[in-house]
């Protein structure tokens, strides 16, 4: 057993980023930050458990920004972070860092959680040995820590596996039934290999010099470059200097309560289901008793608040604790060119001109589905759409009905009646046609416009 | 502004379903908010059964759990409750209610319905 | 499951008196990480479905009166009538949404 001690520096912009504080126009904030410890070196998504221990720090002090005033190193909280673990310290292991922001203000729901930063290291470590100090840097932040492992009494070792007393102390205190073998005494730590990097090496046994990941050469001096071998296990290759296959770790799967095994260099990882933690999954983890769900998130567990919990977000959030805000305007879902607001609770789009509808769906201007009346037509053009009415009606959708004889269309003092199918004139004596615009000569012939070309006087005359 | 109407029959016979709809208008049930089943017995004992939320995720009361469940037409915009093998202890007044994520509140309550379990 | 008890089961007072309830859950309803009591109280009128009134233990609902004030934190929580009204005839109900929701057995008030 023992503890992974972190201790945050500072959290600020990093070199050229972030001119502006996240504070300014969000009113009073503060920081806090989560630790997260994934046993071996594989790249995990954020999502799947901390197998080895998770801690949340305090809250930091209120801080309200100046909007115009340049970001500082924003105020951090008080104290270490500590991760306690049960089994024998790794050696190897994922440190995820996240930085948050609890939001002060009026809005509903009270206070909100957003996350500033996530930082992912993978990393080598002797438990008992010296703080490793580490800067990062994520998107325009830059987070400067420090962090180590130490064993708790009466473990100690590099992996905390080995038990000791302290000298002339009794074995058991009063009353109690005989203590575990312990070795005779706590020894002093093994005097390394001369030379050996007291940052980048340590050692287990007297006079060796064993690196951290990263670093190389009989005294850890000589940083490496990523082997495309090192996932494989076994005894060393002479042709490739590779490893090859030997019998795997995961033989038996050692992970409990349905964990899934997955072979790491010389060891294996349990990937936990959610609720348990530890090298093999043995260890219950958060619960809805945890009130673990950010963001106004229900708690979904088992039976009772102590069984293994989801958490059902509201809308605009996601992530298995309801704490990554989703762009919901990145799915693009206003169409036809309208701008989407995430307004929080809901999803607004603002059309453009002639367009409607909850998604800018409806084309104003389009014959889809637009209905003209009364026998009228639909005719498109000039990204616009008008009615084209049937005889007696008029009006943007032919709805109205119109007066054939308004326009009083009967020439030459000819009467007009309306009629289902149009008007009829009623011509005055001397005038024909239907709409009385010739007039008739005393002989009886009316005059009428001259023979088109090749018609000889006489011949049946057709007019449009 | 949000209505919520109840709808089903009102005498079930002991050891049937007892199937009921919730009519949402005013707001659309995929958007926000969950939408919640909570019954009161004869004794005013007030019970929550359990909800779908706006993106159609359930959870259910753990005593009612082998019996209940809640799902949704989005189309009609209405949810239900199907509560499988009644006795007579499941007679009550069911209300469908639709509860706010931020306050973790039962914001607004339908008027309720209802049934009676008999032979 | 949480188990929610309320006290007294009911009780009469006369208007213009100041009433208090009291609620108790068998587990805290304190979210460290959102600093919220998840209890919220509701009002039954006779004939109609309940109506929040307090959220977060404390925080009133909008339209609620101010003469009603929740109070409390952890496990026990208290709603408080400065002055009743004839019109606050009602059963009282507090309900914890912690974990899943839980309702309490409620406190009848009469006029």
């Known amino acids: 057993a023992g503890v992974f001690e972190l201790q945050i520096h500072s959290f600020g912009p990093g070199p050229g980023g972030a001119p502006r504080s996240p504070y300014s126009a969000r009113g009073p904030c503060r920081l806090f930050f989560r630790v997260c410890l994934k046993p071996g070196l594989s790249e995990e998504a954020a999502e799947s458990p901390c197998a080895l221990g998770a801690a949340l720090s305090a809250r930091g002090p209120v801080y309200t920004e100046q909007p115009e005033a340049p970001a500082p190193d924003l105020p951090l909280p008080n104290g270490l972070l500590q991760v306690p673990f049960r089994d024998a310290w790794p050696g190897t292991f994922s440190l995820i860092i996240e930085t948050w922001r609890e939001e002060l203000g009026d809005q509903i729901g009270g206070p909100a959680w957003s996350l500033l930063a996530r930082v992912t290291r993978r990393r080598r470590l002797a438990a008992g040995g010296p703080w490793a100090g580490d800067i990062q840097r994520a998107g325009a932040w830059e987070l400067r820590f420090s962090y180590r492992a130490r064993c708790e009494l009466p473990a100690v070792g590099t992996a905390c596996t080995r038990l000791c007393r302290p000298r002339s102390a009794s074995r058991c205190g009063p009353g109690l039934r005989p203590c575990a073998p312990l070795e005779d005494e706590c020894e002093a730590p093994p005097v390394c290999r001369a030379g050996c990097s007291l940052e980048h090496g340590f050692c287990e046994q007297p006079g060796e010099c064993r690196c951290l990941e990263g670093w190389t050469g009989p005294l850890c001096m000589v940083p490496v470059s990523t082997s495309s071998c090192l996932g494989l296990r076994g005894p060393s290759s002479t042709t490739t200097g590779c490893l090859v296959p030997g019998p795997g770790p995961c033989d038996g799967n050692p992970c409990a309560n349905g964990g899934s095994c997955s072979e790491t260099p010389g060891s294996f990882e349990c990937t936990c289901p959610r609720g348990f933690y530890g090298l093999r999954c043995e260890v219950s983890g958060v619960t809805c008793a945890d009130g673990p769900c950010f963001n106004g998130g229900l708690c979904v567990g088992g039976a009772d608040p102590d069984s293994a919990y989801i958490c059902h977000c509201p809308p605009g959030f996601q992530g298995s604790n309801c704490e990554k805000r989703v762009d919901r305007c990145s799915l693009q879902p206003c169409r036809n060119g309208g701008l989407c607001l995430d307004l929080g609770h809901a999803l607004r789009c603002r059309c453009r001109a002639g367009f409607a509808g909850p998604r800018c769906e409806h084309d104003l201007n389009d014959c889809a589905g637009r209905a003209c009346a009364n026998g009228g037509t639909c005719v498109e053009g000039g990204g616009a759409h008008r009615c084209s009415c049937a005889l007696g009606f008029g009006g943007r959708d032919c709805r109205e009905r119109a007066d054939p004889c308004a326009a009083r269309p009967c020439a030459h003092g000819g009467r007009c009646y309306a009629h289902f199918s149009g008007l009829v004139c009623a011509c005055a004596p001397g005038y024909m046609g239907a709409r009385c615009e010739f007039p008739v000569h005393p002989d009886g012939v009316s005059a009428l416009p001259a023979a088109p070309p090749g018609l000889r006087p006489g011949d049946p005359q057709r007019y449009p | 502004d949000v209505q919520l109407q109840e709808s089903g029959p009102g005498l079930v016979k002991p050891s049937q379903s007892l199937s009921l709809t919730c009519s949402v208008t005013?707001?659309?049930?995929?958007?926000?908010?969950?939408w919640n089943w909570i019954r009161q017995f004869p004794g005013n004992k007030l019970e929550w059964m359990g909800y779908?939320?706006?993106?159609?995720?359930?959870n259910y009361d753990p005593s009612l759990k082998n019996r209940i469940s809640i799902t949704r037409d989005t189309s009609k915009n209405q949810f239900f409750l199907k509560l499988n093998s009644v006795t007579a202890e499941d007679t009550a007044t069911y209300y469908c209610?639709?509860?706010?994520?931020?306050?973790?509140?039962?914001?607004?309550w339908g008027q309720g319905t209802s049934v009676t379990v008999s032979s | 499951d949480i188990v929610m008890s309320q006290s007294p089961s009911s009780l009469a007072v006369s208007a213009g008196e100041k009433v208090t309830m009291s609620c108790r859950s068998s587990?805290?309803?304190?979210?460290?990480?959102?600093?919220?009591?998840?209890l919220a109280w509701y009002q039954q009128k006779p004939g109609q479905p309940p109506k929040v009134l307090i959220y977060?233990?404390?925080t009133r609902e909008s339209g609620v009166p101010d003469r009603f004030t929740g109070s409390g934190s952890g496990t026990d929580f208290t709603l408080t009538i400065s002055s009743v009204q004839a019109e606050d005839l009602a059963v009282y109900y507090c309900e914890q949404s912690f974990y899943l929701f839980t309702f309490g057995t409620g406190t009848k008030l009469e006029i």
């Open positions: 005013g707001y659309s049930i995929t958007s926000d908010f969950y």
């Open positions: 587990q805290s309803l304190f979210n460290s990480r959102t600093r919220k009591n998840y």
């Open positions: 209610v639709y509860g706010d994520f931020n306050r973790h509140a039962m914001d607004y």
């Open positions: 779908i939320t706006y993106d159609g995720s359930t």
């Open positions: 977060w233990a404390s």
